[in-house]
Amino acid sequence: SSPTSSASSFSSSAPFLASAVSAQPPLPDQCPALCECSEAARTVKCVNRNLTEVPTDLPAYVRNLFLTGNQLAVLPAGAFARRPPLAELAALNLSGSRLDEVRAGAFEHLPSLRQLDLSHNPLADLSPFAFSGSNASVSAPSPLVELILNHIVPPEDERQNRSFEGMVVAALLAGRALQGLRRLELASNHFLYLPRDVLAQLPSLRHLDLSNNSLVSLTYVSFRNLTHLESLHLEDNALKVLHNGTLAELQGLPHIRVFLDNNPWVCDCHMADMVTWLKETEVVQGKDRLTCAYPEKMRNRVLLELNSADLDCDPILPPSLQTS
């Protein structure tokens, strides 16, 4: 039997086969050059090989494809389109492959693709139609269930003259293709805000990770429609306080667990409602770890230990008494 049929071993192709085979239709148990394949595990790994393009001769059996640690730069339309199609491909990991551009329709013709990881790529140009595949107002539903986009923010000097948040959200919302998305990870992307319409159009979300961003406020974000949401990660942001509307929305979600660690909470009079809520809610995980960052006199005080007398605001002076 062929070496690819063993569950425990990966077969590797000799590098010299690369150019000779790439243009031909794949043989049933062929493994692309610079890759390791296991037919039994339905897995192909082309990891840390400095590949500059997606291998053309991927075996039709592939269910899990790892293309991490390469130098792909651009993912063109139909980057994974094959004849016959890669009908089994369910999990695709492209993290850390120096992608800076993902074009419209890059993931077309992957009817079973459920998990996609583009993390740790400096995506200066993410097409609005990267995931939907077309510019129709309503596209065919994407099969994606998990979309991992952690640390895809490019260096500041490589960003286009537009909002990075807006670019990512446009790709998430185009054609309403991601209505079935259950897990969305957007950690470590320097997000300053969350566009207000994004969550309303992702009604199936179970897990949302917005940790390690720069979110200052959730005032204009609505969680109300996310009735399936199970975990909301907001750790390591720049949140100062959560207001009543947000507290009520979170409290009403039937499955929710919220993570709020390491935010610079401002413990003044505006914090009173949140403290009251924290003392009674069971939805915040590790709420006893939440501490004040400001004002200076309150630094490191535990939110759960505060009472209303602690939470004061300096009186606003009338204009005539204000000094410059």
Partner: antibody, heavy 122, light 111 residues
Framework: EVQLVESGGGLVQPGGSLRLSCAAS????????MSWVRQAPGKGLEWVGF??????????ENSASVKGRFTISRDNSKSSLYLQMNSLKTEDTAVYYC?????????????WGQGTLVTVSS | DIQLTQSPSSLSASVGDRVTITCRAS??????????LQWYQQKPGKAPKLLIY???NVESGVPSRFSGSGSGTDFTLTISSLQPEDIATYFC?????????FGGGTKVEIK
């Protein structure tokens, strides 16, 4: 599929001890609050207490009627919940149910086991 | 502790009848806009089954003839058209405050 299976019930004398177990499967055990609820023969339901999830430190809350006598614990490596019952009284005779709290525990229990009968009698 | 008073304690109705059970709390079970009041169905020798959570949300898989309403302290479970398989005891429960408490139950029988 979520499943909860209680065991350990039986006949015990007043003042005695008993340990109930609940084996959980079909969900990520550490993510959920777990509870015990009991029902005396022909009577209504009585909440015994709960144990919080990993995110909230596995701390417990008990009803006043069992405080100091009953202890709720969990072994996450075995996806198991326990109720250690000491200084048992005849009024503790009941069917004891293990139940899983919903992800947002304020919405209470969404899955229950079939129950195990504890009889306290001399 | 929050006391829950259910009424009636028992009722007998015909198949197809509209059945209403009420539950009154000794204090509000609302917290940040949601009433944390559940309804359970228990058949003889079986574990309770969740029907309604948060006063009005119907649990997945529960027939649409079951509905819940109310807020604050007064709540209602309605069976729009009683079926033979609905013979059971129904309990309300509050999870607004620890300790969680249950109503005394309403036994529903078929005439």
């Amino acid at each position: 599929e979520v499943q909860l299976v209680e065991s350990g019930g039986g006949l015990v004398q007043p003042g005695g001890s008993l340990r109930l177990s609940c084996a959980a499967s079909g969900f990520t055990f550490t993510d959920y609050y777990m509870s015990w609820v009991r029902q005396a023969p022909g009577k209504g339901l009585e909440w015994v207490g709960f144990i919080r999830n990993k995110g909230n430190g596995y701390t417990t809350e008990n009803s006043a009627s069992v405080k100091g006598r009953f202890t709720i614990s969990r072994d996450n490596s075995k996806s198991s919940l326990y109720l250690q019952m000491n200084s048992l009284k005849t009024e503790d005779t009941a069917v004891y149910y293990c139940a899983r709290y919903r992800g947002n525990p304020h919405y209470a229990m969404d899955y229950w086991g079939q129950g195990t009968l504890v009889t306290v009698s001399s | 502790d929050i006391q829950l008073t259910q009424s009636p304690s028992s009722l007998s109705a015909s198949v197809g009848d509209r059945v209403t059970i009420t539950c009154r709390a000794s204090e509000s079970v609302e917290f940040y806009g949601t009433s944390f009041l559940q309804w359970y169905q228990q058949k003889p020798g079986k574990a309770p089954k969740l029907l309604i959570y948060g006063a009005s949300n119907v649990e997945s898989g529960v027939p649409s003839r079951f509905s819940g309403s109310g807020s604050g302290t007064d709540f209602t479970l309605t069976i729009s058209s009683l079926q033979p398989e609905d013979i059971a005891t129904y309990f309300c429960q509050q999870s607004r405050k620890v300790p969680s408490t249950f109503g005394g139950g309403t036994k529903v029988e078929i005439k």
